[in-house]
Interface confidence: low
């Protein structure tokens, strides 16, 4: 079964996923998607990296760690009950069928009831967007997948590969850490 992680409504959720680059800066594309890892790619992609940078993300999803050192753990900001479910971290090692797939189950619990503060802090002021501080502006044009033929600012999401639905729940038991090279 999937490894399970928990968070409370309103908190940030953390889903760990790591790999060891073969050499410094020798990055491997990674995608994070909602739903169990299918045979190929990720399903509904929420974040993607390529050999150089984070090239696609959606609001509330970011990498807090140093992805250039292989820490591709996903942070989901200000979670709600709807964020519960399985997430796929796919480390897209070059070569056919070499990908490493990790399914992580996120369980969201209702927030503990506490007395309301006299004045609520603005959430976005308390938690500024990591992606902005890293210099990743919003994608100007949304197109598909980890595609080699378009600018990084244009890249968006979608599984580049067709999958046989019978194999879509190809789940792993191992922890989400691998070594490459």
């Amino acid at each position: 079964s999937e490894v399970e992680y928990r968070a409370e409504v309103g908190q940030n959720a953390y889903l760990p996923c790591f790999y060891t680059p073969a050499a410094p800066g020798n990055l491997v594309p990674v995608c994070w998607g909602k739903g169990a890892c299918p045979v190929f790619e990720c399903g509904n992609v929420v974040l993607r990296t390529d050999e150089r940078d984070v090239n696609y993300w959606t609001s509330r999803y970011w990498l807090n760690g140093d992805f250039r050192k292989g820490d591709v753990s996903l942070t989901i900001e200000n979670v709600t009950l709807a964020d519960s479910g399985i997430y796929c971290c796919r480390i897209q090692i070059p070569g056919i069928m070499n990908d490493e797939k990790f399914n992580l189950k996120l369980v969201i619990k209702p927030a503990k009831v506490t007395p309301a503060p006299t004045r609520q802090r603005d959430f976005t002021a308390a938690f500024p967007r990591m992606l902005t501080t890293r210099g990743h502006g919003p994608a100007e044009t949304q197109t598909l997948g980890s595609l080699p033929d378009i600018n990084l600012t244009q890249i968006s999401t979608l599984a580049n590969e067709l999958r046989d639905s019978r194999l879509a729940n190809d789940l792993r038991d191992s922890g989400a850490t691998i070594r490459i090279g």
Epitope: T58, S59, G95, I96, T157, N160, A168
Partner: antibody, heavy 114, light 112 residues
């Protein structure tokens, strides 16, 4: 089993609006994106774009920017294609197709005629 | 846009014969990860397309083994050994590496 069931045929006049539905069953709707594909009478297939069913973010091919809108009703596992200001050249069969087009709806025939 | 050119436009065959359809792309369909994003569909009259082969040579679930795909780079072939009546229809190739996704013009497989 996995099924995509589309709404029935439509007859519209130029300038009107149409909204075509695609109801999914047999899988978790929000785990797979939804594509839309156009097939004009006697012609080939043209990819219109897709919508991420988890984030709701649509992507449109260049030829389908402006009058075309993809949307979702997640609670009903349904994707929608809306075409505004209909033109005669919108006459076609429109297909929804899951993710990378592994499963398709049966198609919705739209006829635009004055 | 990537242009997908299919030949022939029409392919008359006798039942039991072998059929071969060619698809050529205007750009390479090979991704840096080593995969090639070329797929084949069959559309029967009045029906939606059905996926037959994905990634050049992988048969989709439920597709008979008389269907096979081959090729690399920009040149691809779909072969049907022992054509059956249920195989008749229009075959499309498509690519899903370059945006927008594009389809070939179709090859109509019909009885000779």
């Amino acid at each position: 089993q996995i099924q995509l069931v589309q709404s029935g045929p439509e007859l519209k006049k130029p300038g009107e609006t149409v909204k075509i539905s695609c109801k999914a069953s047999g899988y978790t709707f929000t785990n797979y994106g939804m594509n839309w594909v156009k097939q004009a009478p006697g012609k080939g297939l043209k990819w219109m774009g897709w919508i991420n069913t988890y984030t709701g973010e649509p992507t449109y091919a260049d030829d389908f920017k402006g009058r075309f809108a993809f949307s979702l009703e997640t609670s009903a596992s349904t994707a929608y294609l809306q075409i505004n200001n209909l033109k005669n050249e919108d006459t076609a069969t429109y297909f929804c197709a899951r993710d990378l087009m592994d499963y398709w709806g049966q198609g919705t025939t739209l006829t635009v005629s004055s | 846009d990537v242009v997908m050119t299919q030949t022939p436009l029409s392919l008359p065959v006798s039942l039991g014969d072998q059929a071969s359809i060619s698809c050529r792309s205007s750009q390479s369909l090979v991704h840096s990860n080593g995969n090639t994003y070329l797929h084949w569909y069959l559309q029967k009259p009045g029906q939606s397309p059905k996926l037959l082969i994905y990634k050049v040579s992988n048969r989709f679930s439920g597709v008979p083994d008389r269907f096979s795909g081959s090729g690399s780079g920009t040149d691809f072939t779909l072969k049907i050994t022992r054509v059956e009546a249920e195989d008749l229809g229009v075959y499309f190739c498509s690519q899903s590496i370059h945006v927008p996704y594009t389809f070939g013009g179709g090859t109509k497989l019909e009885i000779k």
